[in-house]
Interface confidence: low
């Protein structure tokens, strides 16, 4: 039987006969920035090239127990998890190792920067196929390390990093907090977040997904045939680096944005027990466990979307929060969320030639989050149409009036501190699916896009009596692009997308004395490619 | 902090005469900022990454590094350029006293300076 972690990332289709193609990942080179490694271990012999790069601080002066001499332990194990003959994810991937961590597993930001620069220079001198860089390390938040990762990512390199083992918000650590890096948390065989002594896996909005990271069997540096079990977010990141190598080998032209979307799309959804996370982090932390795609061939032209949460705005009266999509992604909708319910909505606005999602805090509010729905929409032409507050009893409306443009998301933003409980009509007049409806005192913003083969529809779920949570999901074959709430009254905490489900949260009914006049409707906008063949033809 | 680099003195003396005539005022624009690790035990004071503005060329990075050394020498401080970055980010890694940060932040082309810090296997 295969180890639990390999079984967990393997789609059922593979499990019946063989785990995966024996040459998986063969077109990809994976760089490992870690400790020294035992390159002649039978798991990785001939698969890992030890570069001459070494930039490590001296070991601490104190005399350590004999385990301290295991200089190769961490790196050897990770190389085995990525590409090991018996226990590796991408058995065909070739690797190159750079030593940036000393025998105590310690390195420096500067040494890591010089290592990343070495990789970039190697890439320029001898361009090869797709590159994956595995960074199984973490330090405190570092602007410069994040910037270097951003530059390398923009040069077409896929960076995968450990979320960190500090049972803390991953955004406080680098390179985990770099948006361009794929940041991986760790789960165990029971799909619980991994506990490591008194600490454990990091969590939060800077984590992209989780992967197996407890009791992972891999190459041991004790001898050339030994195996050992190790745990940590490094092991989790190594799984994702291996999966990325498999995906890139099958589709070498994938961009970082496409790869990240596929990793999210093929992950197991909603299997992690979120009770382990601090309450305020649960909504921000992705409930995703990485898995290989069911086929090593491409996913075809599918509409892939992901949810990106902003940092918290902070509590000041005029505080705002901004959520951004990656350079290759389109912002298809924008929503906001506040635990106190005191917010002034959200809007899509241009910043540096790209749309961003901005959420606005309200007086007395504890702060807001902006939530962007970021999608891969090749050759898309998107724009935002805005209607100012109507003041009319029927509420404010805006629609996509350009020929061939479809509605992908609705946002509303208001200047008044507290919207009244006025309830606009929930149902749109027939024959006008391309419009957003909102509170009469709010500005309404419609995201309107034209893209080959794209069609969208609005789906609503209204509950007559107030509920703390209302959801509406898109059916199989459709992708959620927009998520908003009707009406935009103050007892609505906000709306956000979780995978293909639109979630609208309201204040605890027992404490607000809400009436049925304030019933809430979750509004989802679901899109798809009308015809895959047609779409691929139009793209050519 | 002890220093085993005996070549400091010689290097700095050579640089003094070469760079003394350079103006010390920064370019017009925003002031450069200083960053350091929020986790105190992980800080590595005495080593700094000086990050230059995006379009700075390698020759300008080297010139800025030399200018820092010359100005530091005039104030009686030894500095050592450990690495000049190019390819990903323009800038350089310098071993110097924290007393020189104010001076370094005023150099032309400087975007920000970050104190080095530790990273750990996870």
């Amino acid at each position: 039987s295969i180890p639990w972690n390999l079984e967990r990332i393997t789609p059922p289709r593979y499990r019946a006969d063989e785990y995966q193609p024996p040459d998986g990942g063969s077109l990809v080179e994976v760089y490992l920035l870690d400790t020294s490694i035992q390159s002649d271990h039978r798991e990785i012999e001939g698969r890992v090239m030890v570069t001459d790069f070494e930039n490590v601080p001296e070991e601490d002066g104190t005399r350590f127990h004999r385990q301290a001499s295991k200089c190769d332990s961490h790196g050897t194990h990770l190389a085995g998890v990525v590409s090991g003959r018996d226990a590796g994810v991408a058995k065909g991937a070739s690797m190159r190792s750079l030593r940036v961590l000393n025998c105590q597993g310690k390195g420096t930001v500067s040494g890591t920067l010089i290592g990343l620069e070495f990789i970039r220079k190697s890439q320029l001198v001898q361009p090869v196929g797709p590159l994956v860089v595995l960074l199984p390390l973490a330090g405190g938040y570092s602007r410069v390390l994040n910037a270097a990762c951003q530059r390398l990512a923009r040069a077409g390199v896929v960076l995968v990093t450990a979320a960190g083992n500090f049972r803390d918000d991953a955004c406080l650590y680098s390179p985990a907090s770099a948006p361009e890096v794929i940041t991986v948390g760790a789960t165990n065989a029971q799909d619980q977040p991994v506990t490591l002594g008194t600490l454990g896996t990091n969590f939060g909005r800077c984590v992209d997904l989780f992967a197996p990271g407890e009791d992972i069997i891999g190459a041991s540096s004790d001898c050339s045939t030994c195996f050992v079990s190790q745990s940590g977010t490094s092991q989790a990141a190594a799984h994702v680096a291996g999966i990325a190598a498999m995906m890139l080998s099958a589709e070498p032209e994938l961009t970082l944005a496409e790869l990240r979307q596929r990793l999210i799309h093929f992950s197991a959804k909603d299997v992690i027990n979120e009770a382990w996370f601090p309450e305020d982090q649960r909504v921000l932390t992705p409930n995703l466990v990485a898995a290989l795609p069911p086929s090593t061939h491409g996913a075809g032209w599918q509409l892939f979307c992901r949810t990106v949460w902003s940092a918290h705005s902070g509590p000041t009266r005029m505080a705002t929060a901004i959520a951004r999509c990656a350079p290759d992604e389109e912002l298809l909708s924008c929503s906001s969320f506040s635990r106190s319910g005191k917010r002034r909505g959200e809007r899509m606005e241009a910043q540096g030639g790209k749309l961003v999602c901005r959420a606005h805090n309200a007086f007395g509010g504890e702060g807001v989050y902006a939530i962007a729905r970021c999608c891969l929409l090749p050759q898309a032409n998107c724009s935002v149409h805005t209607a100012p507050p109507a003041e009319a009893s029927m509420g404010t409306r805006v629609h996509c009036h350009q020929q061939g443009h479809v509605l992908t998301g609705c946002s509303s933003h208001w200047e008044v501190e507290d919207l009244g409980t006025h309830k606009p009509p929930v149902l749109r007049p027939r024959g006008q699916p391309n419009q957003c409806v909102g509170h009469r005192e709010a500005s309404i913003h419609a995201s309107c896009c034209h893209a080959p083969g794209l069609e969208c529809k609005v789906k609503e779920h209204g509950i007559p009596a107030p509920q703390e949570q209302v959801t509406v999901a898109c059916e199989e074959g459709w992708t959620l692009t927009g998520c908003s709430a009707l009406p935009g009254t103050s007892h609505v905490l906000g709306a956000y997308a979780v995978d293909n489900t639109c979630v609208v949260r309201s204040r605890d009914v027992s404490t607000t004395g809400s009436t049925s006049e304030e019933a809430v409707t979750a509004v989802a906008i679901c899109c798809r490619s009308r015809h895959l063949a047609q779409a691929s033809q139009e793209l050519q | 902090q002890e220093d085993e680099d005996g070549d400091y003195e010689e290097l700095v003396l050579a640089l003094r005469s070469e760079e003394d005539g350079l103006a010390e005022a920064p370019e017009h624009g925003t002031t450069a900022t200083f960053h350091r690790c929020a986790k105190d035990p992980w800080r590595l004071p005495g080593t700094y990454v000086v990050v230059l503005k995006e379009e700075t060329h390698l020759s300008q990075s080297e010139r800025t590094a030399r200018r820092l050394q010359a100005q530091a020498a005039r104030r009686g401080y030894l500095t050592k350029i450990l690495h000049v970055f190019h390819g990903l980010l323009p800038g350089f890694l310098v071993k110097m006293s924290g007393d020189l940060l104010e001076l370094a932040l005023k150099l032309p082309h400087v975007d920000y300076i970050e104190e080095d810090s530790s990273v750990f296997a996870q």
């Epitope: 004999r66 385990q67 004790d222 001898c223 | -």
Partner: antibody, heavy 118, light 113 residues
Framework: EVQLVESGGGLVQPGGSLRLSCAAS????????MNWVRQAPGKGLDWVST????????NYADSVKGRFIISRDSSKHTLYLQMNSLRAEDTAVYYC???????????WGRGTLVTVSS | DIVMTQSPDSLAVSLGERATINCKSS????????????LGWYQQKPGQPPNLLIY???TRESGVPDRFSGSGSGTDFTLTISSLQAEDVAVYYC?????????FGQGTKLEIK
């Protein structure tokens, strides 16, 4: 007190089965690989099997492969050796030994005698 | 498998004298990545389990008297007792832990002359 205590030995007929146990105390059991080492009467030491700290990896001497199964219960801090299809040459004192995690044995139990005879 | 061969099979030494036991492995047990020899020495007194004396070929386990020392590298190793005491009467085994199967030497019986 740091110690290992074996039990379960005895007389068994050829072809029979026996299950040995080793109770560990005084150290973090889950953090260490564990081993069974045997010693035939008047003979030297013979490594039998090892199991990783997590229980995920096992190794066996060729002479017992397919007949013996090593396992551990972390909640009970106990190591086991299930011995099937026993032969006369399996007669020995069986020692439970804690692994330093390198492969040398830094703590041994007092042993339990297994006699395979008709 | 790595075969470990000890010599002599038995040894009689006077109290206070030096005792030397040799161990040879059929292949090197030196691991180049950390420059360690994966070799240990054990002492087994009559009716007792073995006890680890030396690991990494030359590092004494805590609590082991300093009259015991180990040396050698690669394939040839030596255990030395600098001044034999009565309580040192035992059988001594070397063991390689470079790779599984872990293997022991056949043992050297040390007696007092």
């Amino acid at each position: 007190e740091v110690q290992l205590v074996e039990s379960g030995g005895g007389l068994v007929q050829p072809g029979g089965s026996l299950r040995l146990s080793c109770a560990a105390s005084g150290f973090t059991f889950n953090n260490y690989a564990m081993n069974w080492v045997r010693q035939a009467p008047g003979k030297g030491l013979d490594w039998v099997s090892t199991i990783s700290g997590s229980g995920g990896t096992t190794n066996y001497a060729d002479s017992v492969k397919g007949r013996f199964i090593i396992s551990r219960d972390s909640s009970k801090h106990t190591l086991y050796l299930q011995m099937n299809s026993l032969r006369a040459e399996d007669t020995a004192v069986y020692y439970c030994a804690k692994d330093s995690n390198w492969g040398n044995f830094d703590l041994w139990g007092r042993g339990t005698l297994v006699t395979v005879s008709s | 498998d790595i075969v470990m061969t000890q010599s002599p099979d038995s040894l009689a030494v006077s109290l206070g004298e030096r005792a030397t036991i040799n161990c040879k492995s059929s292949q090197s047990v030196l691991y180049r990545s950390n420059n360690r020899n994966f070799l240990g020495w054990y002492q087994q007194k009559p009716g007792q389990p073995p006890n680890l004396l030396i690991y990494w070929a030359s590092t004494r386990e805590s609590g082991v008297p300093d009259r015991f020392s180990g040396s050698g590298s690669g394939t040839d190793f030596t255990l030395t007792i600098s001044s034999l005491q009565a309580e040192d009467v035992a059988v001594y085994y070397c063991q390689q832990y470079y790779t599984t199967p872990y293997t022991f030497g056949q043992g050297t019986k040390l007696e007092i002359k």
